[in-house]
């Protein structure tokens, strides 16, 4: 049994780190492998993660952790029974992938504006809470040529779009993702998309 692609881990900077790797051949990850992790810290214990399959040769493990602080450093050992397949380390604060924003809602009852709101995925006491900026992707299933990214660089999780900039009488979809500039994170996954129908029509005298 051999590791083809070494574990790569990212932290949500809250309570979960996710490690993914590829094996040299088809593997029943949960039955054959264990990923052991231990914080480099006085009197810490070794904890065990049972991986899941992620495709034929891929495995993924969700490591449960306490809140993350910059000093945290973990040793990682990938075992197949009594055989140590790989040994490494992981500093969560240096490999952050934020949680995806949630509760994306479209409000179309605001006169001539489409208002999008979503929820910050972190509690106020988390360091990332006040550091997230967002990208909102809006596209149309009726008009495949239309796809826009709106960068939201302010803290409030809202975006206002003049309804007049969208075609009337067709449906649109939106999704949102986040990143934290000061923590040099990757982008989060996209939120689930939400759909709305743009029924806005310009006033008669403007046509």
């Amino acid at each position: 049994m051999k590791v083809l692609q070494e574990p790569a881990c990212v932290s949500d900077y809250m309570s979960i780190s996710t490690c993914e790797w590829k094996m040299g051949g088809p593997t029943n990850c949960s039955a054959e492998l264990r990923l052991l992790y231990q914080l480099v810290f006085q009197s810490s214990e070794t904890h065990t993660c049972v991986p899941e399959n992620n495709g034929g040769v891929g495995c993924v493990c969700h490591l449960l952790m306490d809140d993350v602080v910059s000093m945290d450093n973990y040793t990682l050992d990938l075992w197949a029974g009594q055989q140590l397949l790989w040994k490494g380390s992981f500093k969560p604060s240096e490999h952050v992938k934020p949680r995806a924003p949630g509760n994306l809602t479209v409000h179309t009852n605001v006169s001539d504006t489409v208002l999008l709101t979503w929820s910050n995925p972190y509690p106020p006491d988390n360091y990332l809470y006040n550091d997230l900026t967002y990208a909102v992707n809006i596209w149309s299933e009726n008009d495949p040529a239309y796809s826009r990214i709106h960068n939201v660089t302010y803290l409030k999780p809202t975006l206002r779009i003049p309804a007049s900039t969208l075609k009337s009488g067709i449906s649109y979809r939106a999704r949102v993702r986040a990143w934290a500039q000061h923590y040099n994170t990757t982008w989060s996954e996209w939120s689930p998309s939400t759909k709305w129908y743009n029924s806005y029509r310009e006033p008669f005298e403007q046509r």
Epitope: L39, F41, Q42, S43, S44, E45, L64, D66, V69, D72
Partner: antibody, heavy 125, light 112 residues
């Protein structure tokens, strides 16, 4: 009531052995790391050894490394310190103390918040 | 190893007056914001040590509020706002960030 009671001290000749015990009660013993601290006559406090809650991780002062062994039996709620190759400078009162909660991924520390009454070890010919 | 240096080593105090003991570590014992791994212990004559302050500034259960801890990184202070006769004994700071845990030399507080 949370309590630690040491036993096993006594008079021993240089080169001899002693085994100290520390019985814990009133708390979930296996969840906490435990520590031994000693105090030579008229001197300050000196850390000797610590062990994680599971017993899987042990730590020693350089002055006792290779001679002392810390262990625990969580089924008996008891901490041990096996002292071999004793020297005159090991003469001290030995205290056990309740250390950090080590079942969490990052152990939670509340100080050495419970101490035993101490047991006296005298090494002399 | 982290060396802990206490001062003064002897502290005569008048009852009702404040007292202050300093402890300096040879390297930072700050793990993360608010988590300085320094404790303060009091050992009264013929007794086991008792915890006063942990993590730099957190008062242990049952400890009178006249005791307080402060500091961060390498410099720490134990303050007694109004010394009482029962406060006499040896005061020790200790770092527990990493083994070996190390204690200061001890400060003997006595009543004038």
């Amino acid at each position: 009531e949370v309590q630690l009671v040491e036993s096993g001290g006594g008079l021993e000749q240089p080169g001899g052995s002693l085994r100290l015990s520390c019985a814990g009660s009133g708390f979930t013993f296996r969840d906490f790391a435990m520590t031994w601290v000693r105090q030579a006559p008229g001197k300050g406090l000196e850390w000797v050894s610590s062990v994680s809650g599971s017993g899987g991780n042990t730590y020693y002062a350089d002055s006792v490394k290779g001679r002392f062994t810390i262990s625990r039996d969580n089924s008996k709620n008891t901490l041990y310190l096996q002292m071999n190759s004793l020297r005159a400078e090991d003469t001290a009162v030995y205290y056990c103390a309740k250390d950090r909660l080590s079942v969490t991924v990052r152990p939670r520390y509340y100080g050495l918040d419970v101490w035993g009454q101490g047991t006296t070890v005298t090494v002399s010919s | 190893d982290i060396v802990m240096t206490q001062s003064p080593l002897s502290l005569p105090v008048t009852p009702g007056e404040p007292a202050s003991i300093s402890c300096r570590s040879s390297q930072s014992v700050l793990y993360s914001i608010g988590y300085n791994y320094v404790d303060w212990y009091l050992q009264k004559s013929g007794q086991s040590p008792q915890l006063l302050i942990y993590l730099g500034n957190k008062r242990a259960s049952g400890v009178p509020d006249r005791f307080s801890g402060s500091g961060s990184g390498t410099d720490f202070t134990l303050k007694i706002s109004r010394v009482e006769a029962e406060d006499v004994g040896f005061y020790y700071c200790m770092q527990s960030l990493t083994s070996p845990y190390t204690f200061g030399q001890g400060t003997k507080l006595e009543i004038k």
